[in-house]
């Protein structure tokens, strides 16, 4: 039979510049001598010879003189290969081929890695920064392998995904320099962190920059928004109210108005230096241009979608700045429930039936209540499931399993917790005339 050759299942991870051992072993039979051994290491794909042992002698490295066997351990079945000063180009699969009387082979993977340097951060522009200014933050980390994953987040740890451009360039040694650029509109204060992750080493290198824009001696602008969330029906338009008090002599040329998503800092709409810069949010937003000069910075959001739900920050900068966040709560009414009964014929008292109540295209998730004809809640044996469609609207299906009495009315109430809207349906089940004793 074939000779059994063992190698590790998982790739061998080696840092660039260090030595790596590609383990390989076989089980020598009693009386085995090295004169009988043929050992060949080769690159799996190209079959290029790496190292060999034949006719009792180490034939040496055929791989840039950077490989060695463990001669003292060969007789015990240790055919491992030492690879010195690992390079990126060494990454790949190596086959260990052992022949005595029979032969066998197995392949081991070498995964090369190099840690990324602590990122350096640059800010452009880096002086005379004001709220509302757009800045470019560059995060650079060097000499890593393999390609990095780069993550940006704000001071609260919230991921920043919009307006990020990441490029990775390999040098002559195959190591990567990574440059990631975040373009962001400045708020009052901001900490921006860049995390460079080596996916193989699971090593994170991070740096952050805190930007404090210049303040005016004349003091902050007071910005007012409603305390309660703005509730908007899906498909309708919503107004996110925001106002400030303009000083005498105020002109729109002095105004920087920015609406952005509070969490991600994604730009929604802006007005700068006397001009509406337009919607950066799927062209569904508008300001009230005729009212801006009076301090009305409200935002109109058209054709509201479920995905719009969340907090929007209204950021006003004149000489100085102020900001406030308003919450948008999206809602959609649930349809009148449809009721199905299974089984739905030849029903007798004592039969178990399943009543399904279905209501469609509501938001947010519904509360479902069952009750009998006397208004007594039915809580046992109820299973409710809610599934969101592509638009994020929920279809709700609630199943009641009940044992029939003589007659019964079963009502299902689907409540939208935001709209405080109740949609209900009911079914009345009249059993067959009863005979005593009931027929089997």
């Amino acid at each position: 039979g074939a000779l059994e050759v063992q190698v590790p299942e998982d790739p061998v991870v080696a840092l660039v510049g260090t030595d790596a051992t590609l383990c390989c072993s076989f089980s020598p039979e009693p009386g085995f001598s090295l004169a009988q051994l043929n050992l060949i290491w080769q690159l799996t794909d190209t079959k290029q010879l790496v190292h060999s042992f034949a006719e009792g002698q180490d034939q040496g490295s055929a791989y840039a003189n950077r490989t060695a066997l463990f001669p003292d351990l060969l007789a015990q079945g240790n055919a491992s290969l030492r690879l010195q000063r690992v390079r990126v180009a060494d990454e790949g699969s190596f086959t260990c081929f052992v022949s005595i009387r029979d032969f066998g082979s197995a392949a081991v993977s070498l995964q090369v890695a190099a840690p990324y340097s602590k990122p350096s951060m640059t800010l452009e522009p880096n002086k005379d920064l004001r709220p509302g200014d757009t800045v470019t933050i560059t995060c650079s980390s060097y000499q890593g392998y393999p390609e990095a994953e780069v993550f940006w987040q704000d001071g609260q740890g919230v991921p920043l995904t919009g307006n990020v451009t990441t490029s990775q360039m390999a040098n002559e040694q195959g190591l990567f320099d990574v440059h990631s650029i975040l373009r962001v509109v400045l708020g009052a204060n901001g900490t921006y962190s860049c995390l460079v992750r080596n996916p193989v080493l699971q090593q994170d290198a991070h740096s952050s920059v805190t930007i404090t824009p210049q303040r005016s001696p004349t003091g902050a602008v007071e910005v007012q928004v409603p305390e309660d969330p703005v509730v908007a029906l899906v498909g309708t338009d919503a107004t996110l109210r925001c106002s400030f008090s303009p000083e005498p002599g105020f002109s729109l040329a002095q105004l920087n108005l920015i609406w952005q998503l509070t969490d991600t800092k994604q730009l929604v709409h802006s007005f700068t230096e006397g001009r509406d810069q337009g919607s950066a949010y799927a062209n569904r937003t508008a300001l009230f241009p005729d009212l801006l000069a009076q301090g009305n910075a409200s935002l109109r959001l058209q054709r509201v979608r479920v995905a719009d739900e969340g907090s929007f920050t209204c950021f006003v900068s004149i000489r100085d700045f102020g900001s406030a966040a308003v919450s948008l709560q999206v809602a959609a009414p649930y349809s009148k429930p449809s009721m199905t009964l299974e089984p739905n014929k030849d029903l007798r008292p004592g039969d178990t039936v399943t009543i399904t109540c279905s209501s469609y295209r509501g938001y947010p998730e519904a509360e479902v209540f069952w009750q009998d004809g006397q208004g007594v809640p039915l809580t046992g044996n109820v299973t409710t499931s809610q599934m969101a469609n592509e638009q994020g609207l929920f279809d709700v299906h609630s199943v009641l399993r009940v044992v029939l009495g003589a007659n019964g009315t079963y009502s299902c109430l689907v409540r939208n917790p935001v709209l405080q809207q109740d949609a209900h349906g009911s079914v009345t089940i009249t059993g067959q005339p009863m005979t005593f004793p009931p027929e089997a």
Epitope: K127, G274, R319
Partner: antibody, heavy 116, light 107 residues
């Protein structure tokens, strides 16, 4: 180091157009607005307009709206200003300068001579 | 547009003398004023921004002050290399506007 390179001189005929260039290096081109400023001999400085290289958004001085057109080529980190329907009044030194409120780096200027 | 009035249009000063140039604006521009120096045959160079912040590498004999509509540039101890034309510029509004310039010469 930051550099804004402009050709030294351009000679053009009246009525013609000219496209002045400003090649940026030593910084992230898309991070700063690029401004253009006109200076006539022994006269003051006039702001023509500016362009955001990131998305090519422009702002113009109304006095130059029909005279100048600003563009950029991000791949070569170069800003351009096209001046049309040239007259002797357009003979001047034209500078590019980066920044929003402060112009911290300026090109050496291109001397435009409009003459037949 | 915001009008910028700079004075004097020209002056001559001796080495070591203190020089003051003023700039007035037609409306309140808070503190968004910059000063530039232009030597003959050269492009302008930023000296001061935000009315009083000295640009990196600018000698400390230069200083700026003012806010609202009245601003000044002061050169403590005039040096021969300070021979140049000085411009103020407002950054409060678009279009950006410059003062007419002050030509400073050595006496």
């Amino acid at each position: 180091q930051v550099q804004l390179q402009q050709p030294g001189a351009e000679l053009v005929r009246p009525g013609a157009s000219v496209k002045l260039s400003c090649k940026a290096s030593g910084y992230t081109f898309t991070a700063y607005w690029m401004n253009w400023v006109k200076q006539r001999p022994d006269q003051g400085l006039e702001w023509i307009g500016r362009i955001d290289p990131y998305d090519s958004e422009t702002r113009y001085n109304q006095n130059f709206r029909d005279k100048a057109r600003l563009t950029v080529d991000k791949s070569s980190s170069t800003a351009y200003m096209q001046l049309s329907s040239l007259t002797s009044e357009d003979s001047a030194v034209f500078y590019c300068a980066r920044g929003v409120r402060i112009f911290d780096y300026w090109g050496q200027g291109t001397t435009l001579t409009v003459s037949s | 547009d915001i009008q910028m009035t700079q004075s004097p249009a020209s002056l001559a000063a001796s080495v070591g003398e203190t020089v003051t140039i003023t700039c007035r604006t037609s409306e309140n521009i808070d503190y968004t004023l910059a000063w530039y120096q232009q030597k003959p045959g050269k492009s302008p160079q930023l000296l001061i921004y935000n009315a009083n912040t000295l640009e990196d590498g600018v000698p400390s004999r230069f200083s700026g002050s003012g806010s609202g509509t009245h601003f000044s540039l002061k050169i403590n101890s005039m040096q021969p290399e300070d021979t140049a034309t000085y411009f103020c510029k407002q950054a409060y509004d678009v279009p950006r506007t410059f003062g007419g310039g002050t030509k400073l010469e050595i006496k």
